[in-house]
């Protein structure tokens, strides 16, 4: 029962995690305009992996896709790749884990096969979660680097009265969604791996078989053999990596009640 619960919970957690990874990948708010010095702005910029958007205070929003592949930064391409790999692995993992669920009966599938599939899906979820966390972290690192670079060059063209203020970008909502989703997928994968141990047939102490020899009543206990499942007891030493999830409220770009500017 505990195994079924662990497996089912692992599946649900991974499902939520992968849905979150997909959502994060599609979201436009990977980086948002830094509003620290100007909390009320008439033009608000934000960017995703696939397009950049501008929201005017009039409410008009315009988004432009990145219609080039070669012209994009290598880091952005790497983040895209990591997120897509994470989604693909997660989707395959979900497919495999559906058939591996103990509560679902498919023909005469043995527990050993289900255990194999559970472990496979678990590993896929772990790798998927790690891909998402890595992708989001790479993007976040890129943002931090650019943030401090643009802070150093905050005002360019100061010769005279004219000021050109550079737009600085900070963490968008998608980063937090991605971190949490990656963490959930990772946790779900670990739970699947734990559940797999319960599904794998243990070292069986076979019941004594009574052989009735003529004139004797002697019971023979044949030497037990190990059922080869492919999963030894070494799974007890598995390390669990927990993705640290950060949550922060996103700065609202619209003017809120009674703003003075």
């Amino acid at each position: 029962m505990a195994v079924t619960a662990c497996q089912g919970l692992g599946f649900v957690v991974s499902l939520i995690g992968i849905a979150g990874i997909i959502a994060a990948t599609c979201m436009d708010q990977w980086s948002t305009q830094d509003l620290y010095n100007n909390p009320v702005t008439a033009v608000f910029n934000y960017q995703g992996l696939w397009r950049s958007c501008v929201r005017e205070s009039s409410g008009f929003t315009e988004c432009r896709g990145y219609f080039t592949l070669l012209g994009l930064p290598a880091m952005l391409q790497a983040v895209r790749a990591l997120m897509i790999v994470g989604i693909v692995l997660g989707a395959i993992g979900l497919l495999v884990s559906i058939f591996a669920l103990k509560c679902i009966r498919i023909g005469s599938m043995e527990d050993s096969a289900k255990a194999n599939m559970t472990l496979t899906s678990g590993i896929m979820f772990i790798v998927s979660g790690l891909c998402a966390i890595a992708g989001v972290s790479v993007f976040a690192n890129m943002l931090v680097t650019n943030f401090w670079m643009s802070t150093a060059n905050m005002y360019t063209g100061m010769g005279g009265m004219v000021q050109t203020v550079q737009t600085r970008y900070t963490f968008g909502a998608a980063l937090f969604v991605g971190w949490v989703a990656g963490g959930l997928t990772l946790i779900g994968g670990v739970m699947m791996c734990i559940a797999c141990r319960g599904l794998a047939p243990e070292e069986t102490n076979y019941k004594a078989v009574s052989y009735h020899a003529s004139g004797h009543s002697v019971a023979y206990k044949p030497g037990g053999f190990k059922a080869s499942t492919g999963f030894g007891s070494n799974t007890k030493n598995k390390k669990i990596y927990d993705g640290g999830a950060r949550t922060e409220d996103e700065v609202q770009s619209y003017p809120s009640k009674h703003d003075y500017v």
Epitope: N45, S57, V162, T167, S256, H258
Partner: antibody
Framework: QVQLVQSGAEVKKPGASVKVSCKAS????????MNWVRQAPGQGLEWIGQ????????TYNGKFKGRVTMTADKSTSTVYMELSSLRSEDTAVYFC???????????WGQGTLVTVSS | DIVMTQSPDSLAVSLGERATISCKSS????????????LTWYQQKPGQPPKLLIY???TRESGVPDRFSGSGSGTDFTLTISSLQAEDVAVYYC?????????FGQGTKLEIK
């Protein structure tokens, strides 16, 4: 067609308050910000602030801090701009204007002349 | 606040001739996110409210005659009337639409020579 109709001229004493109304028609009232701009006699334009009738959010020019209040009545598609502690330099024509893409103001009311005189 | 400075304060041009009004801002009005300049031009005739002519520095509002054109980027902008008509006599204002509080130029009075 879009129309913004403002209330009539007002004469106020210094220190008093004035409330100017702007009734909108011909568009989705709650979906557009409404700006208030004033113009002193023979002078240029000065932005006072804006209100979003959909939720009542406002953004004011810091110059008018604490003196201006903008409200909206969705049932009558009317926005109001109240200016308190009036001074003689507040004598101006007050315009309401709809806010659209490009952060531009496309339709304007006919204007309301507010005269502050003792 | 962004300061908008128009020049000249007044301008007299013959009918059918080109009229050019300049507007300078104390800060760049170019938004890096969409490479658009948040500068708006208005026309105000005596006793009337202002009328929107151009937004995003160069996009003509629907219904505005094509003799009106806007150009410029960053801090320097120009409104051009290619062939002045009698009905173009008015005061023209540029406006910062990029940063709160929105600010207007002092206006340029256009007259017929």
């Amino acid at each position: 067609q879009v129309q913004l109709v403002q209330s009539g001229a007002e004469v106020k004493k210094p220190g008093a308050s004035v409330k100017v109304s702007c009734k909108a028609s011909g568009y989705a009232f709650s979906s557009y910000w409404m700006n208030w701009v004033r113009q002193a006699p023979g002078q240029g334009l000065e932005w006072i602030g804006q209100i979003y009738p959909g939720n009542g959010d406002t953004t004011y020019n810091g110059k008018f801090k604490g003196r201006v209040t903008m409200t909206a009545d969705k049932s009558t598609s009317t926005v109001y701009m109240e200016l308190s502690s009036l001074r003689s330099e507040d004598t101006a024509v007050y315009f309401c204007a709809r806010f659209v893409k490009g952060n531009a103001m496309d339709y304007w009311g006919q204007g309301t002349l507010v005269t502050v005189s003792s | 606040d962004i300061v908008m400075t128009q020049s000249p304060d007044s301008l007299a041009v013959s009918l059918g001739e080109r009229a050019t009004i300049s507007c300078k801002s104390s800060q760049s009005l170019l938004n890096s996110g969409n490479q658009k300049n948040y500068l708006t031009w208005y026309q105000q005739k005596p006793g009337q409210p202002p009328k929107l002519l151009i937004y995003w520095a160069s996009t003509r509002e629907s219904g505005v005659p094509d003799r009106f054109s806007g150009s410029g980027s960053g801090t320097d902008f120009t409104l051009t009337i290619s062939s002045l008509q009698a009905e173009d006599v008015a005061v023209y204002y540029c406006q910062n639409a990029y940063s709160y509080p929105f600010t207007f130029g002092q206006g340029t009075k256009l007259e017929i020579k």
